[in-house]
Every structure is written in C-alpha cells, then in structure tokens.
C-alpha cells in the first residue's frame, strides 16, 4: 500500500494488511486502516470513518492530518505522542469528530504543530492545560500559530455549572503557552462576554474572530496590547454600542480592520460618539451597512446617515411621575 508519487493521489490501506501490523514503529510507507495517505503531499486523511481513537500507526512523514467527521469523544494526554515523534506534523484538523473532552497534554510531543482546528465539537470538558501541556505557571511555548475553535459550545444540558467562556479562556491562557498565537477563531460559541484578561495575554494575535456570539458589550475588553491585530470579526453579536474607550483603542491599532455587521445597534444618545467615529474612521469594513435596531422609530436607519439630533434619549421620569 505504498503511496503513489503524485501529490494529489492517495493510497488507502486495506484492512487485511493493517491487521498484520505489529506494535513496532510504523514503516515509512505505512498507511493506517480507514485512512488515505500521500507521502508526496505529506498528508493523511482519516475522514468520516467513525474512528473512536487516533490511529497509533500514523506515518512519521505526516505534515497535514485530517481526522474530521469521526467519533473520537476523548483526546487523552499524549494522544499524538509517538516513538519516534510526529516531528513534522504542522496542521491538525479534528473538526466534527464528536469530541467532548480534551485532556491536559493532548497535543504534547508535536514540536511543529502550527495549525489546530477543533471546530464543531461539543467541548463540555476542555482542560485548562489542553494546549500548554502542564500546570506550570509558565509553560514551554506552544508552536501553535492558528487555533480554530468555532462552534465548540456543547448543548446546554451538557455544560458544567461553570462559565463556558471561562473554561475556554483558561485553556488559552494557561502557562502563557500561546504567546505566539496569530489567529484565533472563536465564532458561534454563545459567548456572552469576553473575559477582560484574555486579549492582553495573546500579544501576537493578527486575526481574531468572535462572530456569531452573544457579546453585548466590549466595555471591559482592552485591545490596546494587540498592536499586530489586522482583523477583528464581531459580526452577528448582540452589541448595542461601542463606547469611547473602545473606539479610541481600535483607532490606535495600526493595521486593524473591524467587521461589525448584523449587531442590534441602539441608536439613542449613547450612540453619538460611535456615529461620529464611524464617519471619520477607515478601520470599519462595510460601515455603510450598519443600521439601527432600536428604538423602534430608528429601526433600519443607516448609522452613517444619523446626526446628533436623531440620537436622543427619553428623559428619565422622577418616580412620582412614572406610571406602572
């Protein structure tokens, strides 16, 4: 079952061959059962095969590993640890594999791992040390550059009594291992808030995707340290207004592009600063598409077309004049 020389073609191993495999390190041209391998492309694909664990006999040449659409359930410590190690593995895609638990040290002994995709797995239990590998206050730096965690929120009945946001952030910050992370995608996770310390500790971020969450406010979030940030996706959240502090921080980032579409902007007196900023800034992509959702009289008005006279707040009545 040797891979062909063409980078675009894959060899797949026959079960009767694989059943003869011993527990010795894999042969250079060996391909695990239920997988397709291309040594030329340094790629192994074990896709939609209902695997319940990571194959032990992955070829040492693998650089790109696709384990999508399986039923892995659990990634234990050292799930990819091999002798000799998978020293070239750079891109690992585990999306849609029914993972609900990722244990401490799951990605240890992968010295070249730069891209990791855990999207579309209901991660009820993401260890704080899943990415750092140890509970030391400062861990060895992770080689990860891209971490894709879109739609990893479990169903409500499977969530613990703790904050899901807190669980994810603990894993991102543990041991300061992800200081080199450049791309972080956290879309579609029902996040209600962004813990204030998370961005400050990921100083290398270039791309941050928080789209399709339930973020109501960025008041306590600081973007000041993210001097390399190039794109910030905040589409499809529950943002009502961006306040002065946030506007100033975003404006101060030299390379930033911000995406704000499909948020329920509240066009009252608190929106005045944001409207003024929108008219002047170049950082917001598609700013002409931003429209008011509230109050009712302002619905669908384009933010860029508003002036200060449009942005009023109903006076707060003293208690004696309020009706029930």
């Amino acid at each position: 079952s040797s891979p062909t020389s063409s980078a675009s073609s894959f060899s797949s191993s026959a079960p009767f061959l694989a059943s003869a495999v011993s527990a010795q390190p894999p042969l250079p041209d060996q391909c695990p059962a239920l997988c397709e391998c291309s040594e030329a492309a340094r790629t192994v694909k074990c896709v939609n095969r209902n695997l319940t664990e990571v194959p032990t006999d992955l070829p040492a040449y693998v650089r790109n590993l696709f384990l999508t659409g399986n039923q892995l359930a659990v990634l234990p410590a050292g799930a990819f640890a091999r002798r000799p190690p998978l020293a070239e593995l750079a891109a690992l895609n585990l999306s849609g594999s029914r993972l609900d638990e990722v244990r401490a040290g799951a990605f240890e002994h992968l010295p070249s791992l730069r891209q990791l995709d855990l999207s579309h797995n209901p991660l009820a239990d993401l260890s704080p040390f899943a990415f750092s590998g140890s509970n030391a206050s400062v861990s060895a730096p992770s080689p990860l550059v891209e971490l894709i965690l879109n739609h990893i929120v479990p169903p409500e009945d499977e969530r613990q009594n703790r904050s899901f946001e807190g669980m994810v952030v603990a894993a991102l910050l543990a041991g300061r291992a992800l200081q080199g992370l450049r791309r972080l995608e956290l879309a579609s996770n029902h996040f209600l808030y962004l813990p204030r310390d998370v961005l400050a500790q990921l100083p290398s971020l270039r791309h941050l995707d928080l789209s399709n969450n339930s973020l109501v406010s960025l008041t306590y979030v600081s973007f000041r340290n993210l001097t390399h940030l190039e794109s910030l996706h905040l589409e499809d959240n529950a943002l009502k207004v961006l306040h002065n502090g946030t506007l100033a921080e975003l404006q101060g980032l030299p390379h930033i592009r911000v995406f704000l579409d499909n948020n329920p902007w509240v066009c009252d007196c608190h929106m005045a600063d944001m409207v003024t900023w929108l008219k002047e800034t170049e950082v917001v992509q598609g700013k002409d598409r931003l429209t008011c959702a509230y109050p009712e009289k302002m619905r669908n008005r384009v933010l860029l077309e508003l002036n200060s006279a449009d942005l009023d707040c109903d006076p707060i009545l003293p208690p004696s004049l309020q009706t029930s």
């Epitope: 079960p15 694989a18 059943s19 495999v21 527990a23 695990p32 059962a33 239920l34 997988c35 074990c46 095969r49 209902n50 695997l51 319940t52 664990e53 990571v54 194959p55 032990t56 006999d57 039923q71 359930a73 659990v74 234990p76 410590a77 609900d100 638990e101 244990r103 009820a124 239990d125 260890s127 499977e158 613990q160």
Partner: antibody, heavy 120, light 111 residues
Framework: EVQLVESGGGVVQPGRSLRLSCAAS????????MHWVRQAPGKGLEWVAY????????YYADSVKGRFTISRDNSKNTLYLQMNSLRAEDTAVYYC?????????????WGQGTTVTVSS | DIVLTQSPDSLAVSLGERATINCRAS??????????MHWYQQKPGQPPKLLIK???NLESGVPDRFSGSGSGTDFTLTISSLQAEDVAVYYC?????????FGGGTKVEIK
C-alpha cells in the same frame, strides 16, 4: 443476538506458541473495538490487549508486550490473539470482549472464554 | 498504572438487604464531565457481565436494584435489595488510560 465465541485454547509447553480466535456474530463487527481479557485460575480479571475497529490502533498490557499480537479480519468477523514465547503465568481463561467506544464505556459483551494451559 | 482497590473482599448480606461495594482508584479516573469506571458481575463458570458503565449508567437489561455512584477516585456499587441470583463476584474496571485495570473483586454471598 450478539455472540462472541473463542477457540484455539489448549495445553502447550513453555516457550511455544498458540493462536486464539474469536468469532463474532449478531452485530456489525467492523464498527467495534475489541479486547482480550484473561483470568488465571481462581484469580481476578486482567486486561491483555485491544484493537480498534479498523486495526489502526492496538495496545497491550506490559506483561504480554512483545510476545502477543492482536489482530482482526473484518471480512471474516474474527478477532485473533497470537501468543508466542508462552510462560506458565500465561495460564488462564482468555475472553474476547467488545467495546462500543475506546474510552467512554465498558466492555458490553463477552465470549464464554477459552482455556490456555502452559505447562511442561 | 492505575491500581483499583475494592473493599470488602467478600460480603455476606441477607436476602432483601442492601449490599455496598467500594472501589478506590490510585488516581482520578474522572474528568470534570465524565467518569471512566465500570462495574461487572461474574457468576461461577460464566464470563463477566457489564452492569454499570461510566460510574452510574445502568446497562440495558440490568435490574434497577443495581446502581452506581462516585467520581474522581471513589466509586460505589449498590444492590438495594439482594436477590438469590445476585450471588457472584463483582469487579470494578477503569478505562481512563492504557492499561485498563480491574479491581481485585468482591464476593457477594447470602447470609
């Protein structure tokens, strides 16, 4: 009805080899990981080896590593245990057992067992 | 390796009375969400039979007088009202990591 039937046991001298088989029926064999577990006379249970549904993953107890090899033939619905360099302490009833998923659940079906006696 | 210690080694209980068996692991076999401890019943001359999976989930077809509880390192199998057919040896087993290990067994008899 799920059935697992072991065979291949017997009396063998130390240092010799034996191959056990486990014939599976009543379920889609290729969807399940399989284990061998043994029980020495009058003793408790000892896990021996595991093989994943597609034979891409296998694990062994330290006590048998390098001597025993687990394999399967999904086209024949059969699990095997090749036992080499047998020792007196390998004397036991050997059971094959099925697991729905590697970590999460227990061994939900077991065969009746086959007896291996290593004696000079 | 994770060592599972069962207690007591044997247990004599009157018919209709409660029987409780404990299993302690040398390290945690639970994550914050799941437990990887299972219980088996073995009658003389028969293979083991799965009773409880993942600490507390009753296997299909097992009478509801059997129940399991616990997490971390301490687990319990309870037979709420012992019947004559429950005379057997009971084993705990973890699947947290390789190697899987079994407890030493608890023999349940009728007093």
């Amino acid at each position: 009805e799920v059935q697992l039937v072991e065979s291949g046991g017997g009396v063998v001298q130390p240092g010799r080899s034996l191959r056990l088989s486990c014939a599976a029926s009543g379920f889609t064999f290729s969807n399940f990981g399989m284990h061998w577990v043994r029980q020495a006379p009058g003793k408790g249970l000892e896990w021996v080896a595991y093989i994943s549904s597609g034979s891409s993953t296998f694990y062994y107890a330290d006590s048998v590593k390098g001597r025993f090899t687990i394999s399967r033939d999904n086209s024949k619905n059969t699990l095997y245990l090749q036992m080499n360099s047998l020792r007196a302490e390998d004397t036991a009833v050997y059971y094959c057992a099925r697991s729905p998923a590697y970590y999460r659940y227990g061994l939900d079906y077991w065969g009746q067992g086959t007896t291996v006696t290593v004696s000079s | 390796d994770i060592v599972l210690t069962q207690s007591p080694d044997s247990l004599a209980v009157s018919l209709g009375e409660r029987a409780t068996i404990n299993c302690r692991a040398s390290q945690s076999v639970s994550s914050s969400t799941f437990s990887y401890m299972h219980w088996y019943q073995q009658k003389p001359g028969q293979p083991p039979k799965l009773l409880i999976k993942s600490s507390s989930n009753l296997e299909s077809g097992v009478p509801d007088r059997f129940s399991g509880s616990g997490s971390g390192t301490d687990f319990t199998l309870t037979i709420s009202s012992l019947q004559a057919e429950d005379v057997a040896v009971y084993y705990c087993q973890h699947s947290w990591e390789i190697p899987y290990t079994f407890g030493g067994g608890t023999k349940v008899e009728i007093k």
